[in-house]
Interface confidence: low
């Protein structure tokens, strides 16, 4: 492979490897690898492995997320599980004979133990294991809102399945709201989608750990498969660094246009179709703010500079641990135009024309 | 601004401007600007301006979309409107006395006129103008499926509003399916969300051009505000190039790992924590496929090479019309790890660790 000068493939790999070294430490806010002196012998505890697998499965089932990430998202997230309040609790009494819904209650003090402050929560998922089923059903999820009211959160069309399968609902906003309130019991309702015409509004889907016990329920003895919240949060001690002076800036028009930033930033550029391109054929708009990205993204050697100060720079200058980080567009927007083909005016949309923000990548 | 060598800011701007020249022509698949000889005098037709504004408003209300784009998405999209079948049509007779829903029917031959082939459709939105309302209501959209059945498409929580406002539903899949069928009448149902408990399942939301006429209906005389489909499609003549040999490849692991691509591509790199980093403190996983991006992204001068062949290269090598395109990650994935702090095992998720695909940006 060659660009202008010959690329030393081994050197690129070495630089990438060393960048990853710094990246991982920096994401964990560690100045050096933690001591292994106190690690107990033997395999990992089963609960830890189960949690690790939940997290890994979540990754497998998701598409990549190239959204601009807030500063806190750069850092590692601690993953915890909060099980729903036990079904024997009196709070479930009133819900027993309702055929269209099942209910899951959670103790917010358990959640607060895992996430002491609402802004630390990065993601919360409600996980339910659905048992095998031969029917298709449209289901809905609600949040307990006030004494007798429920707020709609989302829906899913569940097709028949031969094996138990996990359902996952993003409930980050709900859990963050609970953390903003006092301690207490909060809950979700999982319901059949009730049709305006239909008479049969029974929930046919069975959830492990809630629906009446059947042979074949998997591992309910171990509590592993009853509904739970999967929480991802920035640990409190790591969060204290987030508001320090060396924070990750959004390299967007708000920041870049009003600063004298020498490093990677979005630079202002207005294209006037007539003046800049000598074009009269685009009728609307007359021009647009195209902008462009410019500025260095220094490569940071983590080998000879294993200090917190240097590691903090990864976040801004090389968050992807690239062997040669580059200043490129992050958020782009489309541009609609009006032009003529012969006598016929056309409206067309051009994708990714306007650079809104940049990043080192 | 300086990187290793001083950057000539004016030259960068000039290169960006010339890149945009090539970019726009290339997106429109034009070898040169279209002739203006036949353009009628006077202002743009009102319907064209309304359509342009619809498109521009759609852009204003949306966040940037940094998703990997299929090849067809690179090119410009022609925008058209298809109005719903007139309310006086006999097809609406059966639906008049239903209080929980309103119905909107469309003639697929009108849609086919705008989009001759299903794959050309890039996006279809159902646009409804809701009249001012003092109530909050949870509404749902359904697609006509067979004679008497309706398929759920989506929902919206509509809060009170003092002014009429446009609602937009993405119905791309539905419209594409209609185009795959024969000509005929197809429809949508806009319904109250019927609760399992509630007795009042009446639709309180009023839609311009459907709900009983009230003073204050805006511009129904001009038909501008009755429900319509906003369609974005690749014009037929532009589409014929899409399957040519010089197509835009996904620079992902599937393609790059099995090819000898010299230009920008994702390159294979497995990090073994122990061997590569000398680390024993990460217990799971033992390593991961980090990968990296490498290879040139040639800058294309559009000034002296205004030919279709060269313009086609923009799509692969410089889709963002950058002054200095760079090979960078496109799709990234997180990595969950298990490690110990003292005696306490921790599961943490590290964002953007695995490079799945690259792009010239």
């Amino acid at each position: 492979l060659s660009t202008c000068k010959t690329i030393d493939m081994e050197l690129v790999k070495r630089k990438r490897i060393e960048a990853i070294r710094g990246q991982i430490l920096s994401k964990l806010r560690l100045a050096s690898p933690p001591s292994q002196g106190e690690v107990p012998p033997g395999p990992l505890p089963e609960a830890v492995l189960a949690l690790y697998n939940s997290t890994r499965d979540r990754v497998a089932g998701e598409s990549a997320d190239p959204e601009p990430e807030p500063e806190a998202d750069y850092y590692a997230k601690e993953v915890t599980r909060v099980l729903m309040v036990d079904r024997n609790n009196a709070i479930y009494e009133k819900t027993k004979d309702i055929s269209h819904s099942i209910y899951m209650f959670f103790n917010t003090s358990d959640i607060r133990e895992a996430v002491p402050e609402p802004p630390l929560l990065s993601r919360a998922e409600l996980r339910l294991q659905r048992l095998k089923s031969s029917v298709e059903q449209h289901v809905e999820l609600y949040q307990k809102y006030s004494n007798n009211s429920w707020r709609y959160l989302g829906n899913r069309l569940l097709t028949p399945t031969d094996t138990p399968e996990w359902l996952s609902f993003d409930v980050t906003g709900v859990v963050r709201a609970w953390l903003n309130q006092g301690d207490g019991i909060q809950g979700f309702r999982f319901s059949a989608h009730c049709s305006c015409d239909s008479k049969d509004n029974k929930l046919h889907v069975e959830i492990n750990g809630i629906s009446p016990k059947r042979r074949g329920d998997l591992g309910t003895i171990h509590d592993m498969n009853r509904p739970f919240l999967l929480l991802m949060a920035t640990p409190l001690e790591r969060a204290q660094h987030l508001h320090s002076s060396r924070h990750r800036r959004a390299l967007d028009t708000n920041y870049c246009f009003s600063s004298t930033e020498k490093n990677c930033c979005v630079r202002q550029l207005y294209i006037d179709f007539r003046k800049d391109l000598g074009w009269k054929w685009i009728h609307e708009p007359k021009g647009y703010h195209a902008n462009f990205c410019l500025g260095p993204c220094p490569y940071i050697w983590s080998l000879d500079t294993q200090y917190s100060k240097v590691l903090a720079l990864y976040n801004q200058h090389n968050p992807g641990a690239s062997a040669s980080p580059c200043c490129v567009p992050q958020a782009l927007e489309p541009l609609p135009i009006v032009y003529y083909v012969g006598r016929k005016p056309k409206v067309e949309q051009l994708s990714n024309m306007i650079v809104r923000s940049c990043k080192c990548s | 601004l300086s990187t290793c060598k001083t950057i000539d800011m004016e030259l960068v701007k000039r290169k960006r401007i010339e890149a945009i020249r090539g970019q726009i022509l290339s997106k429109l698949r034009l070898a040169s600007p279209p002739s203006q000889g036949e353009v009628p005098p006077g202002p743009l037709p009102e319907a064209v301006l309304a359509l342009y504004n619809s498109t521009r408003d759609r852009v204003a209300g949306e966040s940037a979309d940094p998703e990997p784009e299929p090849e067809a998405d690179y090119y410009a999209k022609e925008v058209t409107r298809v109005l719903m079948v007139d309310r006086n049509n006999a097809i609406y007779e059966k639906t008049k006395d239903i209080s929980h829903s309103i119905y909107m029917f469309f003639n697929t031959s009108d849609i086919r006129e705008a989009v001759p082939e299903p794959p050309l459709l890039s996006r279809a939105e159902l646009r409804l103008q809701r009249l001012k309302s003092s109530v909050e209501q949870h509404v749902e959209l359904y697609q006509k499926y067979s004679n008497n059945s309706w398929r759920y498409l989506g929902n919206r929580l509509l809060t009170p509003t003092d002014t009429p406002e446009w609602l937009s539903f993405d119905v791309t899949g539905v419209v594409r399916a209609w185009l795959n069928q024969g000509d005929g009448i197809q429809g949508f149902r806009f319904s109250a969300h019927c609760s399992c408990d509630s007795k009042d399942n009446k639709l309180h939301v009023e839609i311009n051009g459907i709900s009983p006429k009230r003073r204050g209906d805006l511009g129904t005389i001009h038909d501008m505000n009755r429900p319509f489909l906003l369609l974005m499609a690749t014009p037929l003549e532009r589409a014929q190039h899409l399957h040519s040999s010089r197509h835009r490849r996904a620079l992902d692991t599937n393609y790059c790992f099995s090819s000898t691509e010299k230009n920008c591509c994702v390159r294979q790199l497995y990090i073994d924590f122990r061997k590569d980093l000398g680390w024993k403190w990460i217990h799971e996983p033992k390593g991961y496929h980090a990968n990296f991006c490498l290879g040139p992204c040639p800058y294309i001068w559009s000034l002296d090479t205004q030919y279709s062949k060269v313009l086609a290269l923009y799509n692969q090598h410089n889709p963002g019309a950058s002054a200095s395109p760079c090979c960078v990650p496109q799709a990234l994935e997180p990595l969950p790890i298990v490690y110990y702090v003292g005696r306490k095992p921790k599961v943490e998720q590290l964002s953007n660790m695995i490079v799945r695909s690259c792009k010239c940006s």
């Epitope: 006030s146 309130q181 708000n254 | 408003d57 204003a60 209300g61 309302s133 003092s134 109530v135 909050e136 009170p160 003092d162 002014t163 406002e165």
Partner: antibody, heavy 120, light 112 residues
Framework: EVQLVESGGGLVQPGGSLRLSCAAS????????VHWVRQAPGKGLEWVSH????????YYADAVKGRFTMSRDNGKNTLYLQMNGLKSEDTAVYYC?????????????WGQGTQVTVSS | LPVLTQLSSMSGSPGQTVTITCTGS?????????LSWYQQLPGTAPKLLIY???NRASGVPNRFSGSKSGNLASLTITGLQAEDEADYYC????????????FGGGTKLTVL
């Protein structure tokens, strides 16, 4: 830290005009609806106007409709209130306030206020 | 007259519990719209105490709580302290008015 700083108040004669500004920082301005609220001397709070996050929708109290115009410049993180045809009953401290969530009409951050006095 | 009705003044001794009420109608509080409570200390800008009827804003002590029933909203302060002496306003979106938003007339709370 979220900050809203009003400016542009002062003494003006009846029938005159003033333009108030509100500079925002510490949050993504373009993601939130913002409002003007006023408080006449010794009186309670009175909602004046609201502009949506993108600046597309604007709403005004009946008392100011047709005389006041609210606008925003998301590039400059600034909110404006153009007040024309001022009356003595417009005398008040004018606060700008940000929505807690996009357009919730719950004001989780307020400016310090700017005094507008309409008097001959 | 304000669409949301509050008592103009109330008083309480330190340590006591006081409840400030705000009465509306089905077009505002009863309609399920976001209801908030604000505290205005003398000479300062108002501050959000409670949002969505019963949620404490960040940094607000848990002595303050909100509730709502039908057309009536309440703000309760337990363990009253001298620094709680202030004006308290309720506010809510109102769907019947072209104005859109209304504040109560305010309650002046004096700590004896």
């Amino acid at each position: 830290e979220v900050q809203l700083v009003e400016s542009g108040g002062g003494l003006v004669q009846p029938g005159g005009s003033l333009r108030l500004s509100c500079a925002a920082s510490g949050f993504t301005f373009s993601n939130y609806g913002v409002h003007w609220v006023r408080q006449a001397p010794g009186k309670g709070l009175e909602w004046v106007s609201h502009i949506s996050a993108a600046g597309i929708s604007r709403y005004y109290a009946d008392a100011v409709k047709g005389r006041f115009t609210m606008s925003r410049d998301n590039g400059k993180n600034t909110l404006y209130l153009q007040m024309n045809g001022l009356k003595s009953e417009d005398t008040a401290v004018y606060y700008c306030a940000k929505d807690r969530i996009r357009s919730s009409y719950e004001y989780d951050s307020w400016g310090q206020g700017t005094q507008v006095t309409v008097s001959s | 007259l304000p669409v949301l009705t509050q008592l103009s003044s109330m008083s309480g001794s330190p340590g006591q519990t006081v409840t400030i009420t705000c009465t509306g109608s089905s077009s505002n509080i009863g309609g399920g719209y976001y209801l908030s409570w604000y505290q205005q200390l003398p000479g300062t800008a108002p501050k959000l105490l409670i949002y969505n009827a019963n949620n404490r804003a960040s940094g607000v002590p848990n002595r303050f709580s909100g509730s709502k029933s039908g057309n009536l909203a309440s703000l309760t302060i337990t363990g009253l302290q001298a620094e709680d002496e202030a004006d308290y306003y309720c506010g809510c979106y109102d769907s019947s008015l072209s104005t859109g938003y209304v504040f109560g007339g305010g309650t002046k709370l004096t700590v004896l």
